[in-house]
Every structure is written in structure tokens, then in C-alpha cells.
């Protein structure tokens, strides 16, 4: 992604010395998502903005690192800085879901969703129902609305598939599950083909 790292760095470099110190202290107590560790206190307190950015990205990956930075900035009352990060997050299509599962699970090829891309684009008609099932846990609000804005089912599915390269296995499984519920016969047909 790259842009998220730059945005985090920009935000941290905008903090005064005291604010950066406060940011680090809050980072030591902020609630973390399950499966993520805390940056050790000793190392954290020594870091400048560049080191801290690198550590945030290496510990939490870009997507969640960006969100965590926003949370801490909001908690500090620095709304404007947090909003700038929110804009970056939306523009880069940083689906938080992509960071919610360790990265090694994202590389598996041959998933139903990848195998049947063309058929799904051509044959899924109840796209809005599929989107509703993916909202929030897979698609950001911006992505959801971007797909809905397309006029035909095929264009909607094409737009949806434009986000798939950044998805992990859980996200793809969510799409498959939604398709099974909304288009069960289509999924059965494709699984047998």
C-alpha cells in the first residue's frame, strides 16, 4: 500500500515533542485487536516518528496500523490529524479486514472466487444482497457505495472483483458464503463444472 505508511509518518511528524510522548503512552494502553502484540515499552519510548512508523507497520501491518494511529489521535483530541488519516484510508481502499488475519493466509490460490471470476461477473444478478452481506466486515462503506453506484449487475460485479486482490482468505470465504445464500444453484452449478 505505501500510502498508509506515509500518512502515518506525516501525522506523527506533525506532533509536538509532548504530543508524541503522549501518543506513545496511549499506545501502551490502547485496546488491541485479538492476535496483535504490544510494542515493548522500553523500545517504544526511545523511538522518533520514523522509527515509530516503521514499528507500527511491522507490528500491525499498514491497514490496522493506520486505524490504530487514528484511534490514538482521536483519543488525544487531535481530530483533524485523525480525519486526514481517515481520508487516506478511504482513498487507498484500506479494508481493515485485510489486516485482521495474519498475512500468510492470504496467498492461497485456487479459491472458488478466483476460479469462477468470469462466470460470477456474468451470472450473479442479486448483487446488492451480496454487498449487504459483505458490508463492513469485507467492504468499507466507500467500497460498498462504489459498487452499488454501477448501473448493471455485471459492472457491479466487475467493480466488486477489483477489490478482491487485496482480500485475504476470510474475505473470499465471506463472498462465497454470501453467494451460497443468495445464489445457491449458481454456486452448485459452478462447483460441479
Amino acid at each position: 500500500m505505501g500510502r498508509a505508511r506515509d500518512a502515518i509518518l506525516d501525522a506523527l511528524e506533525n506532533l509536538s515533542g509532548d504530543e508524541l510522548k503522549k501518543f506513545k503512552m496511549k499506545l501502551l494502553t490502547v485496546q488491541l485487536r485479538e492476535g496483535y502484540g504490544r510494542i515493548p515499552r522500553g523500545a517504544l519510548l526511545q523511538m522518533d516518528a520514523i522509527d515509530l512508523t516503521d514499528k507500527l507497520v511491522s507490528y500491525y501491518l499498514e491497514s490496522y496500523g493506520l486505524e490504530l494511529t487514528m484511534t490514538v489521535l482521536r483519543d488525544m483530541g487531535l481530530q483533524e490529524l485523525a480525519e486526514q488519516l481517515q481520508t487516506t484510508k478511504e482513498e487507498s481502499g484500506a479494508v481493515a479486514a485485510a489486516a485482521s488475519v495474519p498475512a500468510q493466509s492470504t496467498a492461497r490460490t485456487g479459491h472458488f472466487v478466483d476460479q469462477h471470476r468470469q462466470a460470477l461477473i456474468a451470472r450473479v444478478t442479486e448483487v446488492d444482497g451480496v454487498l449487504d452481506a459483505l458490508h463492513g466486515s469485507v467492504l468499507t462503506e466507500g467500497q460498498y457505495q462504489a459498487v452499488r453506484a454501477e448501473t448493471t449487475s455485471q459492472d457491479k460485479m466487475r467493480k466488486l472483483f477489483s477489490f478482491v486482490p487485496s482480500w485475504n482468505l476470510t474475505c473470499k470465504d465471506s463472498l462465497l458464503q454470501a453467494l451460497k445464500e443468495i445464489h445457491p444453484y449458481l454456486v452448485m452449478d459452478l462447483e460441479q463444472s
Partner: antibody
Framework: EVQLQQSGAELVRPGSSVKMSCKTS????????ISWVIQRPEQGLEWIGY????????EYNEKFKGKATLTSDTSSNTAYMQLSNLASEDSAIYFC??????????WGQGTTLTVSS | DIQMTQTTSSLSASLGDRVTISCSAS??????LNWFQQKPNGTVRLLIY???SLHSGVPSRFSGSGSGTDYSLTISNLEPEDIATYYC?????????FGGGTKLEIK
């Protein structure tokens, strides 16, 4: 049975913060989102924001950005909302609601917040 | 923001009556409309989602209809336990917004 059990009534001083909880049961917590809704005295309902549990993805009503912070704890199947810099106009009932396919299907019983000096 | 308007803030009807509560949106909401019931004790429950789908456990005397900007909730055979305030809510666009509510009383 789907249940959302909210924490008890709060009486707090202006300028302080409060963190209310919404303990869920009867469904897979990580498969859903939780939304929060405010109802001021003798008034209607207003959406505050939502959090999707699986990934922590949040969206807020512009009116509540900086006021509300939504979090969750998957180990206890509990969603939280922290309200900061409280003023008398924040006195209200706050509901947590489960989101299913973008609509609100099950509501908590509400937490009454009173901000008074 | 999409404004949701329930023009009737309160209405009175007799037991057994057919009651219709209206709701209009300031722009089209593609049927992304819910109806909620709030009892006098404060409890809220979903009645209808996506304009006309009946939520599980809700009596079939409740029904919803509409499209575009105009929607309605109908109670076909009013019962004592239907005394409540009814809210419509759009979930087409953020911020999700509610109507002002219609308080239903028994004559």
C-alpha cells in the same frame, strides 16, 4: 436466543468520560457489526456509529466524531462505547444494536446516561 | 444527510382497526427502509426490514410497503399490545437516519 445486555445507568460530571458496555450472547459475535444509537429525552433516535467486530472497522456519524469511540473485546463478546468531554446535552439513553446485512435486527435495553454537576 | 419524515406524530385508533403509518425520505433510498417499534417501557424491536420483509417473531398483522421516497407500515388488526411509538429508518446512505416517530394510542 440473541441477547444484548447493556451496562447500568451512569451519573457523571460535565467534562468527564464514560465507557458503556454491550455484552452479547446467542450468536457468533465476530460475524456481525454493532451499532450505537442515542435517544435524548422526549426525542427520537439518532445513529452514532458502528463497529464490525471481525476487523474493528468503524464508521461514525459526523456529529459524533470526537465524542464517541467504539471498540470491542472478542474474548468477552462485548462491544464498548466511550463518550468523552461530556456535557448536559449528552444526557440520554444509549442503545447498542446488532447489525445484520446492514440493518439493525436486535437491540439492547439501553443505558441511561445523566451528566450533571 | 437523508431526512426521514413521519408527518403524523401521533394517531389514535380503535382495537381491530387497520392503521397505516407513513414515512417519506428526502431522496430515493432504494427500499433500504426499516420499521421499529418502541414500547412505553423503552424496549425497541425490529418489525420490518428492507421495506417489506417481516422480521422473525413479528405477527403477520404487520406489513410494510413502498418504493423510491415513500414508505408505509400497516397494522391490519390493531391489538392492545401495539400501543407504542413507531420509527422508520433508512440505511441506504450514511449517516443512517430515523424518522421522528409516530405515537400510536388506543381510542
Amino acid at each position: 436466543e440473541v441477547q444484548l445486555q447493556q451496562s447500568g445507568a451512569e451519573l457523571v460530571r460535565p467534562g468527564s468520560s464514560v465507557k458503556m458496555s454491550c455484552k452479547t450472547s446467542g450468536f457468533t459475535f465476530t460475524s456481525y457489526g454493532i451499532s450505537w444509537v442515542i435517544q435524548r429525552p422526549e426525542q427520537g433516535l439518532e445513529w452514532i456509529g458502528y463497529i464490525y467486530i471481525r476487523n474493528g472497522y468503524t464508521e461514525y456519524n459526523e456529529k459524533f466524531k470526537g465524542k464517541a469511540t467504539l471498540t470491542s473485546d472478542t474474548s468477552s463478546n462485548t462491544a464498548y462505547m466511550q463518550l468523552s468531554n461530556l456535557a448536559s446535552e449528552d444526557s440520554a439513553i444509549y442503545f447498542c444494536v446488532r447489525i445484520h446485512r446492514r440493518f439493525f435486527d436486535y437491540w439492547g435495553q439501553g443505558t441511561t446516561l445523566t451528566v450533571s454537576s | 444527510d437523508i431526512q426521514m419524515t413521519q408527518t403524523t406524530s401521533s394517531l389514535s385508533a380503535s382495537l381491530g382497526d387497520r392503521v397505516t403509518i407513513s414515512c417519506s425520505a428526502s431522496q430515493g433510498i432504494s427500499n433500504y427502509l426499516n420499521w421499529f417499534q418502541q414500547k412505553p417501557n423503552g424496549t425497541v424491536r425490529l418489525l420490518i426490514y428492507y421495506t417489506s420483509s417481516l422480521h422473525s417473531g413479528v405477527p403477520s398483522r404487520f406489513s410494510g410497503s413502498g418504493s423510491g421516497t415513500d414508505y408505509s407500515l400497516t397494522i391490519s388488526n390493531l391489538e392492545p399490545e401495539d400501543i407504542a411509538t413507531y420509527y422508520c429508518q433508512q440505511y441506504d446512505r450514511l449517516p443512517w437516519t430515523f424518522g421522528g416517530g409516530t405515537k400510536l394510542e388506543i381510542k
